[in-house]
């Protein structure tokens, strides 16, 4: 009897190890999306960026969905969200329309159930990019911890999208689940 | 018999609690490395920073290795990587040769198996630090979620290293494992 | 007998699932605190910000305490700490006392046992906000991984608090526990 119980115990331990490992993995959605440079919109006002890579280079996604330019949450939880946005201008690109620029990023959450959009995080700077310098660069980083529900969507808006640095190490955003909701 | 089973169950629970706790700890490597100010290189172009503290002040490391100026991954996984780099100039610091500065950070990953280096994240700004002000300061923060394999190395490159703020709260980088690779 | 054992095993699995889930949640304190705009101090020097929301909008807290303007750690562990601070000025707000500004944030840790305060992270920039532009904006983001002990307190200090952007998406700080201390 005692031997049988030990065997069962071993099974409990074994199956638990698998279950714990598997459930841990499944409980941790993530995404790291990098800018798709072939499809950056123009304009200087606030524009939503809808083209991102999720399956090449540093881009990756698991247990979340990328659709219509939005990162869709599939699993309720508390997530750490982040974005890194780089802007740049070289004099060879032509003259800037204005030397006074507002370079901004807005990380927004949209709920489909209650059709509304809210800014979770914003960052940026006003810049004076004078003609005395042949090259200008500026990066913004934002990050924060948010409760997200299944079906909610995360999107990125920026000002002056034509100034975006198209490199995958420069302009990206992402999320990873840290814990469940009580 | 039933009593015996309950005792076994308690053992299962107990050993499991230990096992789960222990495996959770072992599954979570991390590092927070702060700049070693006694060994900051000179130069104006991209320079690799190789001197960091991992065992004093806020510096710490666990289940990762710091060697030859690089943070070495010992355990496959998805990690959140971050860096905070501060630059500063005071009129007493020395004769600044130019007001137009490119203050940049690059977080790079090197694979020894396939000897190649790739930039995971970059950030920074071009700055105009005029002599009309006696003090100048600027900080960069970058962060992102990346798949790292055992043996891969993370390093930090900056422009204008002699302008780095040598405080441990100013110039640092780090990583922590968030989840396993499926 | 064997049937009885299987029932016990199911109980082990069931209780374990609850226990693991519950202990995981309890092991993961977090906070995301947003600025309380009704109580921003004045001055241009380093000032501690003591008014934050923890229970409205994006503000939230769990297994940590907010008291006297400080975020109090209730559980030993390694935490990821972050802050996002936005400064802004519009010409309609009146003239700035000076065009040369030092816009800074300091994330500090205070230990009650050993009454001392240490800066964990700092960031910011010197800015020239000239009268040639009607609007100025600048954001700082810092983040890092730190060992925190129960009873320790996290607080935020900034320069030029009267220039703070009072939006919840602009000025906030937070923490979440990543792992236990060995």
């Amino acid at each position: 009897g005692s031997q049988h119980i030990r065997a069962e115990k071993a099974m409990v331990d074994g199956s638990w190890l698998d279950l714990a490992k598997r459930s841990k993995l499944e409980a941790q959605p993530f995404a790291h999306l990098t800018i798709n440079a072939t499809d950056i919109p123009s304009g200087s006002h606030k524009v939503s960026l809808s083209s991102w890579y999720h399956d090449r280079g540093w881009g990756k996604i698991s247990n979340m969905t990328f659709s219509n330019g939005k990162l869709i949450v599939n699993q309720d939880g508390f997530y750490y969200l982040y974005a890194n946005i780089c802007f740049r201008h070289h004099e060879t690109s032509g003259d800037l329309a204005t030397e006074y620029l507002q370079l901004m990023v807005y990380v927004t959450k949209t709920s489909i159930k209650i059709p509304s959009s809210h800014t979770l995080m914003k960052g940026g700077s006003t810049k004076y990019w004078s003609g005395n310098s042949e090259f200008h660069f500026y990066s913004i980083n934002v990050g924060g911890f948010f409760k997200l529900r299944s079906g909610e969507e995360i999107s990125i808006e920026v000002s002056n999208p034509s100034l975006l640095d198209p490199d995958q190490d420069a302009t990206y955003f992402g999320a990873f689940k840290v814990r469940d909701i009580d | 018999g039933s009593q015996h089973i309950r005792a076994e169950k308690a053992m299962v629970d107990g050993s499991w609690l230990d096992l789960a706790k222990r495996s959770k700890l072992e599954a979570q490597p991390f590092a927070h490395l702060t700049i070693n100010a006694t060994d900051i290189p000179s130069g104006s172009h991209k320079v690799s920073l190789s001197s960091w503290y991992h065992d004093r002040g806020w510096g710490k490391i666990s289940n990762m290795t710091f060697s030859n100026g690089k943070l070495i991954v010992n355990q496959d996984g998805f990690y959140y990587l971050y860096a905070n780099i501060c630059f500063r100039h005071h009129e007493t610091s020395g004769d600044l040769a130019t007001e137009y500065l490119q203050l940049m950070v690059y977080v790079t990953k090197t694979s020894i198996k396939i000897p190649s280096s790739h930039t995971l994240m970059k950030g920074g700004s071009t700055k105009y630090w005029s002599g009309n002000s006696e003090f100048h300061f600027y900080s960069i923060n970058v962060g992102g979620f990346f798949k790292l394999r055992s043996g891969e190395e993370i390093s930090i490159e900056v422009s204008n290293p002699s302008l780095l703020d040598p405080d441990q709260d100013a110039t640092y980088f780090g990583a922590f494992k968030v989840r396993d690779i499926d | 007998g064997s049937q009885h054992i299987r029932a016990e095993k199911a109980m082990v699995d069931g209780s374990w699932l609850d226990l693991a889930k519950r202990s995981k949640l309890e092991a993961q304190p977090f906070a995301h605190l947003t600025i309380n705009a009704t109580d921003i101090p004045s001055g241009s020097h380093k000032v501690s910000l003591s008014s934050w929301y923890h229970d409205r909008g994006w503000g939230k807290i769990s297994n940590m305490t907010f008291s006297n303007g400080k975020l109090i750690v209730n559980q030993d562990g390694f935490y990821y700490l972050y802050a996002n601070i936005c400064f802004r000025h519009h010409e309609t707000s009146g003239d700035l006392a000076t065009e040369y500004l030092q816009l800074m944030v300091y994330v500090t840790k205070t230990s009650i046992k050993i009454p001392s305060s240490h800066t964990l992270m700092k960031g910011g920039s010197t800015k020239y906000w000239s009268g040639n532009s009607e609007f100025h904006f600048y954001s700082i983001n810092v983040g890092g991984f730190f060992k925190l002990r129960s009873g320790e307190e996290i607080s935020i200090e900034v320069s030029n608090p009267s220039l703070l952007d009072p939006d919840q998406d602009a000025t906030y700080f937070g923490a979440f526990k990543v792992r236990d201390i060995d």
Epitope: N132 | S42, G43, S44, S93, G94, D95, L96, A97, T98, E99, Y100, L101, Y128, S130, G131, N132, N160, P161, S162, L163 | -
Partner: antibody, heavy 122, light 107 residues
Framework: EVQLVESGGGLVKPGGSLRLSCAAS????????MSWVRQAPGKGLEWVAG????????YYPDTVKGRFTISRDNARNSLYLQMNSLRAEDTAVYYC???????????????WGTGTTVTVSS | DIQMTQSPSSLSASVGDRVTITCKAS??????IAWYQQKPGKSPKLLIY???YRYTGVPSRFSGSGSGTDFTFTISSLQPEDLATYYC?????????FGGGTKVEIK
């Protein structure tokens, strides 16, 4: 061709003033810090003034501080040295020199002019 | 101010000889040393910077080494056109100071 050409040297009495000029060509002048270096007859080299690329920082050794003023006009690709309260020991060949790119706090010189002679004598 | 002491003040060597000049700084300058060549009646030319880096277009017979306070400049095989005075300069901290010079003559 990268070139620096000095002018404005001459004979001046002690206590007098002189303004040296340096015309730059063949490179983007506004991107470089510049300096004046002098060489007394039969002697070694002595750095006397430096100016940042944008002109808002100026630097001098104690020997000339308060008497010499370095300036630049980036629109004209020109560097200047205003020398007041001249002394006999200021007699030298004055070279205009371009600071090479490098660490922002370190100055060494990769392009030199041909020099202009300043003689301070009564 | 950092003093730079150069030695010898002059030397005479034959074509093909290896010539070595030393420069001593009064304090640690890490590797922030430049070397210049000044031919008679001409302006100085940059040869070496940051102790050991050859400037663009400088022949490989010219080299530099050292760190801290002691530095060496070497001409591996002296050529007739190397007749000149050679100066070291510290570019570590302002004011930028030069050594007294070493006059190299051809035997």
């Amino acid at each position: 061709e990268v070139q620096l050409v000095e002018s404005g040297g001459g004979l001046v009495k002690p206590g007098g003033s002189l303004r040296l000029s340096c015309a730059a060509s063949g490179f983007t002048f506004r991107n470089y810090a510049m300096s004046w270096v002098r060489q007394a007859p039969g002697k070694g080299l002595e750095w006397v003034a430096g100016i940042s690329s944008g002109g808002t920082y100026t630097y001098y050794p104690d020997t000339v501080k308060g008497r010499f003023t370095i300036s630049r006009d980036n629109a004209r690709n020109s560097l200047y040295l205003q020398m007041n309260s001249l002394r006999a020991e200021d007699t030298a060949v004055y070279y205009c020199a371009r600071r090479d790119y490098g660490d922002v706090y370190e100055w060494y010189f990769d392009v030199w002019g041909t020099g202009t002679t300043v003689t301070v004598s009564s | 101010d950092i003093q730079m002491t150069q030695s010898p003040s002059s030397l005479s060597a034959s074509v093909g000889d290896r010539v070595t000049i030393t420069c001593k700084a009064s304090q640690d300058v890490r590797t922030s040393i430049a070397w210049y060549q000044q031919k008679p009646g001409k302006s100085p030319k940059l040869l070496i910077y940051s102790a050991s880096y050859r400037y663009t277009g400088v022949p490989s017979r010219f080299s530099g080494s050292g760190s801290g306070t002691d530095f060496t400049f070497t001409i591996s095989s002296l050529q007739p056109e190397d007749l000149a005075t050679y100066y070291c300069q510290q570019h570590y901290s302002s004011p930028w100071t030069f050594g007294g010079g070493t006059k190299v003559e051809i035997k």
